[in-house]
């Protein structure tokens, strides 16, 4: 058993049929010594008495809010949550496996630049009685500070018969050095509580591996005289690290016909312009990637040819 926060405790349980559970000692937070009784949740049925109470915790019916009383007055509360371990593996019932980039990916994180700011998100089908708490650091043995905000519901989607809820959080490394080579990874830890079930999820990464630039901005077409060719130009996204001479991007320019089956013409360039043939009803799209490190491509920025 360990304390998650004041008066909230997590009991770690091996979860199998007829498991004996854990013996947990509750102590009433009071100077009183005598006449103390204990109840569980809203029940008026007395569980036991004494300043300390030893309880057997083996199922969710044993979790909940234990309250000690004296003469009708509430003295203190202890909320017990359960963390299940089945076959040596902690349960992951609350969050959905996003399966990208690999199985058992519950947290996904991205950074728009090297400033030390990043966003993580996760998915669940649970809509109520759900709380999240996020902590982060650079390294784990001698951790350096990363400050995370509160997790918020960022999207709702319908997937077949189910509703899916996306939560996200923004974090910022306290003393980020954008140009420095990373040697210790960022660690992100999410505590999830659904009703009386506790779970925790972790992710470990280097900022350089989660970089995904915003799409190029100000995408424009300039027809070339007496030609089917156009000059496409764009700019670095505002959110990208500066100076651009050091934090450089490479770009992919694509000409796509109206039909997805039509052949795509692609051009790769380090410049912020390219000359391409603009076919009727086609569109031109440009995306960006860090020039010196193969992290994710940005989403496409697009304009129609006409």
């Amino acid at each position: 058993i360990w304390e998650l926060k004041k008066d909230v405790y997590v009991v770690e349980l091996d979860w199998y049929p007829d498991a004996p559970g854990e013996m947990v000692v509750l102590t009433c937070d009071t100077p009183e010594e005598d006449g103390i009784t204990w109840t569980l949740d809203q029940s008026s049925e007395v569980l036991g008495s004494g300043k300390t109470l030893t309880i057997q915790v083996k199922e969710f019916g044993d979790a909940g809010q234990y309250t000690c009383h004296k003469g009708g007055e509430v003295l203190s509360h202890s909320l017990l949550l359960l963390h299940k371990k089945e076959d040596g593996i902690w349960s992951t019932d609350i969050l959905k496996d996003q399966k990208e980039p690999k199985n058992k990916t519950f947290l996904r994180c991205e950074a728009k630049n090297y400033s030390g700011r990043f966003t993580c998100w996760w998915l669940t089908t649970i809509s109520t009685d759900l709380t999240f708490s996020v902590k982060s650091s650079r390294g784990s043995s001698d951790p350096q500070g990363v400050t995370c905000g509160a997790a918020t519901l960022s999207a709702e989607r319908v997937r077949g018969d189910n509703k899916e809820y996306e939560y996200s959080v923004e974090c910022q490394e306290d003393s980020a050095c954008p140009a420095a080579e990373e040697s210790l990874p960022i660690e992100v830890m999410v505590d999830a509580v659904h009703k009386l079930k506790y779970e925790n999820y972790t992710s470990s990464f280097f900022i350089r591996d989660i970089i995904k630039p915003d799409p190029p901005k100000n995408l424009q077409l300039k027809p070339l005289k007496n030609s089917r060719q156009v000059e496409v130009s764009w700019e670095y996204p505002d959110t990208w690290s500066t100076p651009h001479s050091y934090f450089s991007l490479t770009f992919c320019v694509q000409v796509q016909g109206k039909s997805k089956r039509e052949k795509k013409d692609r051009v790769f360039t380090d410049k912020t312009s390219a000359t391409v043939i603009c076919r009727k009803n086609a569109s031109i799209s440009v995306r960006a990637q860090d020039r010196y490190y193969s992290s994710s491509w940005s989403e496409w920025a697009s304009v129609p040819c006409s």
Epitope: G21, T37, E45, V46, L47, G48, S49, I55, Q56, V57, K58, E59, G61, D62
Partner: nanobody, 114 residues
Framework: EVQLVESGGGLVQPGGSLRLSCAAS????????MYWIRQAPGKGLEWVST???????AYADFVKGRFTISRDNAKNTLYLQMNNLKPEDTALYYC????????RGQGTQVTVSS
Amino acid sequence: EVQLVESGGGLVQPGGSLRLSCAASGFAFSNYWMYWIRQAPGKGLEWVSTIKTSGSAAYADFVKGRFTISRDNAKNTLYLQMNNLKPEDTALYYCSRDYAGTVRGQGTQVTVSS
């Protein structure tokens, strides 16, 4: 009519063991939390242990891992396994359907003495 009949008490040396039983009838035993309470000579009733309908237990501080409460719903029977008994465990032990002992049996005497 609710009936609770305790048995299994006796005289035992310090460090010894006893297993108390309580046969219940006249009510839906499996639907109730059940309790062991005791009364030492010249003292009031003292709560010992509780077992919930699920089989999960709670114990008084003085028990310190020495006693184990259990139930057999098929036999409508409550048990208290008492190990490493001490002289201060000497008391009349009751099984009860409520914490206050308002619905309890006649008790079984446990005496721990050398």
